[in-house]
Amino acid sequence: QFPRECANIEALRRGVCCPDLLPSSGPGTDPCGSSSGRGRCVAVIADSRPHSRHYPHDGKDDREAWPLRFFNRTCQCNDNFSGHNCGTCRPGWRGAACNQKILTVRRNLLDLSPEEKSHFVRALDMAKRTTHPQFVIATRRLEDILGPDGNTPQFENISVYNYFVWTHYYSVKKTFLGTGQESFGDVDFSHEGPAFLTWHRYHLLQLERDMQEMLQEPSFSLPYWNFATGKNVCDVCTDDLMGSRSNFDSTLISPNSVFSQWRVVCESLEEYDTLGTLCNSTEGGPIRRNPAGNVGRPAVQRLPEPQDVTQCLEVRVFDTPPFYSNSTDSFRNTVEGYSAPTGKYDPAVRSLHNLAHLFLNGTGGQTHLSPNDPIFVLLHTFTDAVFDEWLRRYNADISTFPLENAPIGHNRQYNMVPFWPPVTNTEMFVTAPDNLGYAYEVQWPGQEFTVSE
């Protein structure tokens, strides 16, 4: 959402979020690290091209033309500098001048050593308990953001992991149309459109970098869960990893896992949609998970097959009109899981990414809640690995990622909601090892084992 330094009346009224880096001569003397040439405060560029007609409520949603409703000036960082105040490096770079390339490796969770597995689980738990050092979340829509008295900004601190959950919730929430009116639900800034892969890529990258900083460990990387096993069991659902099934309640996580202690955020959907409030940092009930337990829907009781990945990687076109969840012969819609693995759209099909979520049959299967189950991280790193392999095979051909007329939030140059600083879909449509500083150690069915660099 927004840097803590910008969650105040003055910044909101001015529409300027250009925090100081090293204000040695007092506040406002080093916006965006300008004194050391790292960046400068500039006008925000937001996509103004038309979106598809799915969304008929222009002017009603704070997420439109993100982030212009809140801020119209922000930091533009030079060279490889990055961050809300240009105080960090772009992904894949390090050093005082951000001029040295680095590469971290995302590996299969099951291939990690016992020590590495334990470190990952501990790190996730630490992220759940550690206040995010930079960002705060809005708990009210823009019209109520200054509170009942017009003088109290409605922002809250939130943990590193819950921030990851909140950003996902904010991207999928309904559009509030007013008290007494039903909120509009046919809107999603991160799913059912071309931005699905780029949005989730940045989402993971943000969490990974937040955890690297939290641990002071630049090599820290998020592992993946190869969910394309064709099995009816969750192989990462063991107590040393993501938690086994509780013996006392088959929809809960075993008390032997730290994740049984986790409590979810953003579960009060009815309240948000009727009162027009936003999810806040308050935690509620436990994670629910019942892998392969949806007996009323046999099609989601088994995970995708290995050959489903092979087939989807043969779909050469990134996306196809109408750039939605009914696109056919679209790689994006295929890996997202609304089309069959061959690429053919079938309204009855749930495959790949969608099937893995639905297989979990609980918190992880509900879009507004799903990141609350940390398996979400592993599921999406694997989805991102498939995306990166597609980018590698087809030379990151962005030509079919639409510049306009995609669902709102999904145009190529749209700033992904609600990430800060503003970042477009285009910036994530690149091969990760060369451009984003990470690679996957992965073996695709029928291929040699490689690090994807």
Epitope: H119, Q212, Q216, S219, F220
Partner: antibody
């Protein structure tokens, strides 16, 4: 002036526990990660772990997990290392040291004078 | 875990000479490396961080270099006060291990 002042030498029995302190001055410990390092007699340096005093987060080298425990008191700008289940192998000098909060800077830039712990 | 192999274990040189100490990491540590000097009975003292940046107040006869897995500390125009133990330490991945140390003796 940045200083890390460590507590005095300790002579402890095997199996006992000991709590070492490191009082800092010249900087706010909330802005730095505090690390601890061990040096056995005539041996090299061994990294034990770090604490982020701002939130109490800790990380340990797996070989010290369970025997070392780091805590901080931000009101007195002091960090502590508690060692339990001591054996003669734990006879060493223990150093506290700080790392710049900006994690891009790879260095422990200021060190305490060390505390000698003798297990006998 | 990243292992740091430091060499030589000890060396002896005369005032005015140049010596080089090396550290080899078991994996790429991307310049996340520091060098320290420790005199007998004293605390370690930071010399170099980020593999090649001299810490404040450190004489320019000390210099760090290297990349990837291979790093070195060069001391030119040796002075008597340069005697002591030298250690490298990486900060790439947890745990942040040290090299085994090099004992430098001035003849």
């Amino acid at each position: 002036e940045v200083q890390l002042q460590q507590s005095g030498a300790e002579l402890v029995r095997p199996g006992a526990l000991v709590k070492l302190s490191c009082k800092t001055s010249g900087f706010n410990i909330k802005d730095y990660f505090l690390h601890w390092v061990r040096q056995r007699p005539d041996q090299g340096l061994e990294w034990i772990g770090w604490i982020n005093p701002d939130n109490g987060n800790t990380v340990y080298d797996p070989k010290f997990q369970g025997t070392a425990s780091l805590t901080a008191d931000t009101s007195s700008n002091t960090v502590y290392l508690q060692l339990s289940g001591l054996t003669s192998e734990d006879t060493a000098v223990y150093f506290c040291t700080r790392r710049d909060y900006t994690y891009e800077k790879a260095a422990l830039d200021y060190w305490g004078q060390g505390t000698t712990v003798t297990v006998s | 875990d990243i292992q740091m192999s430091q060499s030589p274990a000890s060396l002896s040189a005369s005032v005015g000479e140049t010596v080089t100490i090396t550290c080899r990491a078991s994996g790429n540590i991307y310049n996340y490396l520091a060098w320290y000097q420790q005199k007998q009975g004293k605390s370690p003292h930071l010399l170099v961080y980020d593999a090649k940046t001299l810490a404040d107040g450190v004489p320019s006869r000390f210099s760090g270099s290297g990349s990837g897995t291979q790093y070195s500390l060069k001391i030119s125009s040796l002075q008597t006060e340069d005697s002591g133990n030298y250690y490298c330490q990486h900060f790439w991945s947890l745990p942040f291990t040290f090299g085994s140390g090099t004992k430098l003796e001035i003849k």
